[in-house]
């Protein structure tokens, strides 16, 4: 289904406007901000979600060491330009003609420049490391149980194929989820790891993007898993290009 037919809503994206104006009176949903039609049977792209968010009213040891090329989204929110497929355009600019290049998850990967800045291609983020710290519990979670439940979560809630969940590491209280998806691995219809990570990030923050579903309630053998902080690192297929000035700052 493209949307819930009964009341014409989008189960996977509450930041939409839906109406029965599709072919044969079918429910069709469009993302806020961009007005682009979205497929409500899967996750909406991060670019369209960010655009919708910006248009909405403002009140509404076994652990992996991130590589030196890992990016963290320090720039926060911006109103992105999305291509006709809903992906980030390689070059993003703000209203004051400051431009920069982004990767496939919309995170800046170059220094900021002016309108003459060129971004030849959209560089794919092929490895995402989600670093979580859980609240204290009576004892540590069983690593195997934790792996099983986090895989189930990504599979069931975000429809991410298990082969893209490369690993779940655990050293109490730190959990690391590694998502990997090369361009060659991603088939038509596969959820993008960047979109899954964004939905997960919003769920963890208590800002679920799903329509009408309760927030994320994750339990491992009945024990609630409550996250108190999240850090997400992004690794691109081509390392980012920042000046030494930024790296030493």
């Amino acid at each position: 289904h493209t949307a819930a037919q009964d009341n014409c809503t989008c189960p996977t994206n509450k930041m939409t406007v839906c109406s029965p104006d599709g072919p044969g009176g079918r429910c069709q949903c469009r993302a806020l901000g961009s007005g682009m039609a979205v497929d409500c049977s899967t996750l909406t792209s991060k670019c369209l979600l960010l655009k919708a968010r910006m248009s909405a009213p403002k009140n509404a040891r076994t652990l992996v060491r991130p590589s030196e090329h890992a990016l963290v989204d320090n720039d926060g929110l911006y109103d992105p330009d999305c291509d006709p497929e809903g992906r980030f355009k390689a070059r993003q600019c703000n209203q004051t003609s400051v431009c920069w290049c982004v990767n496939s998850v919309g995170v800046r990967r170059t220094d900021k420049g002016d309108l003459s800045l060129r971004c030849d291609e959209l560089v794919r983020t092929h490895h995402i490391l989600i670093d979580l710290r859980h609240r204290p519990t009576a004892g540590a979670f069983n690593h195997s149980d934790l792996d099983a439940e986090l895989r189930r979560l990504f599979r069931e809630r975000y429809r991410l194929h298990p082969k893209f969940v490369a690993a779940v590491h655990y050293e109490q209280p730190t959990i690391q989820i590694e998502l990997r998806q090369n361009t060659s691995q991603k088939a038509a219809g596969d959820v993008d790891i960047g979109d899954a990570a964004y939905y997960f990030e919003r769920d963890i923050k208590g800002e679920s993007l799903f329509q009408g579903r309760g927030g994320l309630d994750l339990r491992v053998r009945g024990e609630p898993l409550q996250v108190e902080r999240t850090l997400i690192y992004y690794l691109d297929e081509i390392p980012p290009k920042f000046s030494m000035k930024r790296l030493t700052a």
Epitope: H143, S144, D147, A148, E149, R155, R157, P162, A167, R219
Partner: antibody, heavy 117, light 111 residues
Framework: QVQLQESGPGLVKPSQTLSLTCTVS?????????WNWIRQPPGKGLEWIGY???????LYNPSLKSRVTISRDTSKNQFSLKLSRVTAADTAVYYC??????????WGQGTLVTVSS | DIQMTQSPSSLSASVGDRVTITCRAS??????????LHWYQQKPGKAPKLLIY???NLESGVPSRFSGKGSGTDFTLTISSLQPEDFATYYC?????????FGQGTKLEIK
């Protein structure tokens, strides 16, 4: 000790809706785990139908998704299966089972449902 | 869907024999930490009973003559010394991907 018990009519007419209930004792279905329905046609293997989670989320087998609804009544500690538009191919022993971390550790004893006019 | 293929489909053996049943998945059912492959025993007119979870973990109360091993796509269930109560049908099940799927079963009969 966790126990599961299926109940419901043993005979359903073709094109009607099969309705079964699983009553759980010894554990609250809203406290954790995943509560499943599995079926087994006479003399055949096992087929997973779907589950409802501790938080009320559903996951169904795509081969049955258009006909299946699994719901729950936490006040009675029960979860239910509805399978619409049944045919003779839906004749089976229906089991409810608890999924711990993706395996089934507790099962009901099963109930045979025959689809026949 | 992941297809689970068990071999043999049926097997005749005697009390005291060592028996091995194989289960092959059409794609890997392992993660870096887990092997999402489980074994059940079913006797006529009864519900299946969990024997082994995650490929090699013995469920509480299951005799130690049962053991499991394997990873990726190939798994085995071994009964080291058959007892009269072991004659039953055995099923493997994967839970790496939904829908969860079972093998077609291996019927273990008395020779």
């Amino acid at each position: 000790q966790v126990q599961l018990q299926e109940s419901g009519p043993g005979l359903v007419k073709p094109s009607q809706t099969l309705s079964l209930t699983c009553t759980v004792s010894g554990y609250s279905i809203s406290s954790g785990y995943y509560w499943n329905w599995i079926r087994q046609p006479p003399g055949k293997g096992l087929e997973w139908i779907g589950y409802i989670s501790y938080s009320g989320r559903n996951l169904y087998n795509p081969s049955l998704k258009s006909r299946v609804t699994i719901s729950r009544d936490t006040s009675k500690n029960q979860f239910s299966l509805k399978l619409s538009r049944v045919t003779a191919a839906d004749t089976a022993v229906y089991y409810c089972a608890r999924d711990t971390t993706a395996y089934f550790d507790y099962w009901g004893q099963g109930t045979l449902v025959t689809v026949s006019s | 869907d992941i297809q689970m293929t068990q071999s043999p489909s049926s097997l005749s053996a005697s009390v005291g024999d060592r028996v091995t049943i194989t289960c092959r998945a059409s794609e890997s059912v392992s993660s870096s930490v887990n092997r999402f492959l489980h074994w059940y025993q079913q006797k006529p007119g009864k519900a299946p009973k969990l024997l082994i979870y995650r490929a090699s973990n013995l469920e509480s109360g299951v005799p130690s003559r049962f053991s499991g091993k394997g990873s990726g796509t190939d798994f085995t269930l071994t009964i080291s010394s058959l007892q009269p109560e072991d004659f039953a049908t055995y099923y493997c099940q994967q839970s790496n991907e939904d829908p969860y799927t079972f093998g077609q079963g291996t019927k273990l009969e008395i020779k």
